[in-house]
């Protein structure tokens, strides 16, 4: 003998977050008379999704006109799907009863899986800057994706990195997942312009992976090299001494001239020149009045770079010899814009 069956033809339905899910249900008979209800989950804790008879279900619409007595199609649409909507949905036929309707037959269930895109990967580097030859760690995080399968790659200037560790959480079943990866990068002096890229590939992205980037300019500190040279005499009894500060990054730099250990002048690097690799050069001049000194003068160029302990370079200026014959004839790297440094 024929008896009403509730057919849910789709064992599973996969929907992208934000889209509408159609859950199909057909009753194979118009009798017994009674409403259909949709539930998520089974058992006592099941959640009512739609009740044909009563209630307000703003996100749910019926595919067919359920007011027609000859309707057999009890499919529903759920709008604006989120990962939280994932689960197994059951179409349940009730038989009209008094005082309450009685559950008569349930469909086999349709598992709704939600495809959710991962959030844009956020790459963060170390809190403090590090110098070349040091290894630094970068982290990459992306959240809210489903299903769990995901691929993460690290690149430095287009070259794939291999030294990284990745975790996808949680380990068990969940409505959505997060990925966390830590990569180790060895810094070089040429890394001011370098970029570290975290690339995330997921089924929802249709082959167009998401990328998060970190500029190594935020991470690296390239300490300067100093060179102090004595220039030809500019005027009688005056010697021009230059301190060339080369290949430093970032720009934050303070230079102090000391004459025999006493502070002569302090200045902050302003008009710098940039090298192709992104590091900076700067030059400071000190005009020393030789006639003011009876003894030899020890000139020190002391540089404090990016809050680090000062480094210095000294030059001994002999006052006994004739100024015109003194020192080296090394040409200064004079850009013209540094004239204000000449005292």
């Amino acid at each position: 003998e024929e008896e009403l069956q509730v057919i849910q033809p789709d064992k599973s339905v996969l929907v992208a977050a934000g889209e509408t899910a159609t859950l199909r249900c057909t009753a194979t008979s118009l009798i017994p008379v009674g409403p259909i209800q949709w539930f998520r989950g089974a058992g006592p804790g099941r959640e009512l999704i739609y009740n044909q008879k009563e209630g307000h279900f703003p996100r749910v619409t019926t595919v067919s006109d359920l007011t027609k007595r000859n309707n057999m199609d009890f499919s529903i649409r759920i709008g604006n799907i989120t990962p939280a909507d994932a689960g197994t949905y059951y179409c349940v036929k009730f038989r009209k009863g008094s005082p309450d309707d009685v559950e008569f037959k349930s469909g086999a269930g349709t598992e709704l899986s939600v495809r959710a895109k991962p959030s844009a990967p956020v790459v963060s580097g170390p809190a403090a800057r590090a110098t070349p030859q040091h290894t630094v760690s970068f982290t990459c995080e992306s959240h809210g994706f489903s299903p769990r399968d995901i691929t993460l790659k690290w690149f430095k200037n287009g070259n794939e990195l291999s030294d990284f560790q990745t975790n996808v959480d949680p380990v068990g079943e969940s409505v959505s997942y997060s990925i966390h990866s830590t990569a180790k990068v060895v810094l070089t002096r040429e890394d001011v312009h370098s970029q570290v890229i975290c690339e995330v590939a997921h089924v929802t992205l249709q082959g167009d992976p998401l990328r998060g980037t970190a500029n190594l300019s935020e991470t690296i500190r390239v300490p300067p090299t100093l060179e102090v040279t004595q220039q030809p005499v500019r005027a009688e009894n005056q010697v021009n001494v230059t301190c060339q500060v080369r290949k430093f990054y970032p720009q934050r730099l303070q230079l102090t001239w000391l004459e025999n250990g006493n502070v002569s002048r302090t200045e902050t690097a302003s008009t710098v020149t940039e090298n192709k690799d992104g590091t900076y050069n700067w030059m400071s001049w000190l005009l020393v009045n030789v006639s003011a000194h009876r003894d030899d003068v020890k000139l020190t160029c002391q540089v404090e770079h990016d809050g680090q302990p000062a480094v210095s370079k000294s030059h001994d200026l002999k006052v006994s010899a004739h100024p015109k014959e003194q020192g080296s004839n090394t040409a200064a790297e004079n850009t013209g814009s540094n004239e204000r440094n000449i005292y």
Partner: antibody, heavy 122, light 107 residues
Framework: QVQLVESGGGVVQPGRSLRLSCAAS????????MHWVRQAPGKGLEWVAV????????LYADSVKGRFTISRDNSKNTLYLQMDSLRAEDTAVYYC???????????????WGQGTMVTVSS | DIQMTQSPSSLSASVGDRVTITCQAS??????LNWYQQKPGKAPKLLIY???NLETGVPSRFSGSGSGTDFTFTISSLQPEDIATYYC?????????FGGGTKVEIK
């Protein structure tokens, strides 16, 4: 006026395929469930398949399940029946039909086409 | 599937006669039953829906009754244009099924 016109019938060898079309006019095609019903020569009527007004639900008779596919193009007001792996017993006049009940599958067929003959023979 | 047994399979009656056709369902189908008329070489035409409701435009000499398993279709006064085969169809259960048909002829 309301009209359904079938086409695509013909003689075909067993195991081959055929695609029937049903052009609808005179009513809001996209609001109604649509059916295919067939009638073997000198025999009675047999329901074949139904498709919901929006294509979301499709049901088939056991005799054609897995071989026939019902579909529709609401932008063209056209119903289709793709018939694969045809057998001699599929020889029949194929009618498309609909009911006057909007937004349901509707099984009281008040509008019928004139039918198209499909002959499956080697 | 629900079996629909129609009887007689054919009948011959005179113009003006009352003609009765019966349709029996293999189990209770409530009143979800339709009656169709099919003239030779033509598509079927819906006459009665939900066992007893006359389709718009159908002459009142056609009527239907019954519920559960037993249904009756009646032509109160047979007319020459009524020569056709008549089918019952249930749609309580899927798939919808038709009776074998009753061929009505004029004596």
């Amino acid at each position: 006026q309301v009209q359904l016109v079938e086409s695509g019938g013909g003689v075909v060898q067993p195991g081959r395929s055929l695609r029937l079309s049903c052009a609808a006019s005179g009513f809001t095609f996209s609001s109604y469930g649509m059916h295919w019903v067939r009638q073997a020569p000198g025999k009675g009527l047999e329901w074949v398949a139904v498709i919901a007004y929006d294509g979301s639900n499709k049901l088939y008779a056991d005799s054609v399940k897995g071989r026939f596919t019902i579909s529709r193009d609401n932008s063209k007001n056209t119903l289709y029946l793709q018939m694969d792996s045809l057998r001699a017993e599929d020889t029949a006049v194929y009618y498309c039909a609909t009911s006057d009940t909007k937004y349901t599958l509707g099984f009281a067929f008040d509008i019928w086409g004139q039918g198209t003959m499909v002959t499956v023979s080697s | 599937d629900i079996q629909m047994t129609q009887s007689p399979s054919s009948l011959s009656a005179s113009v003006g006669d009352r003609v009765t056709i019966t349709c029996q369902a293999s189990q209770d189908i409530s009143n979800y039953l339709n009656w169709y008329q099919q003239k030779p070489g033509k598509a079927p035409k819906l006459l009665i829906y939900d066992a007893s409701n006359l389709e718009t435009g159908v002459p009142s000499r056609f009527s239907g009754s019954g519920s559960g398993t037993d249904f009756t279709f009646t032509i109160s006064s047979l007319q020459p244009e009524d020569i056709a085969t008549y089918y019952c169809q249930q749609f309580t259960y899927l798939p919808p099924t038709f009776g074998g048909g009753t061929k009505v002829e004029i004596k």
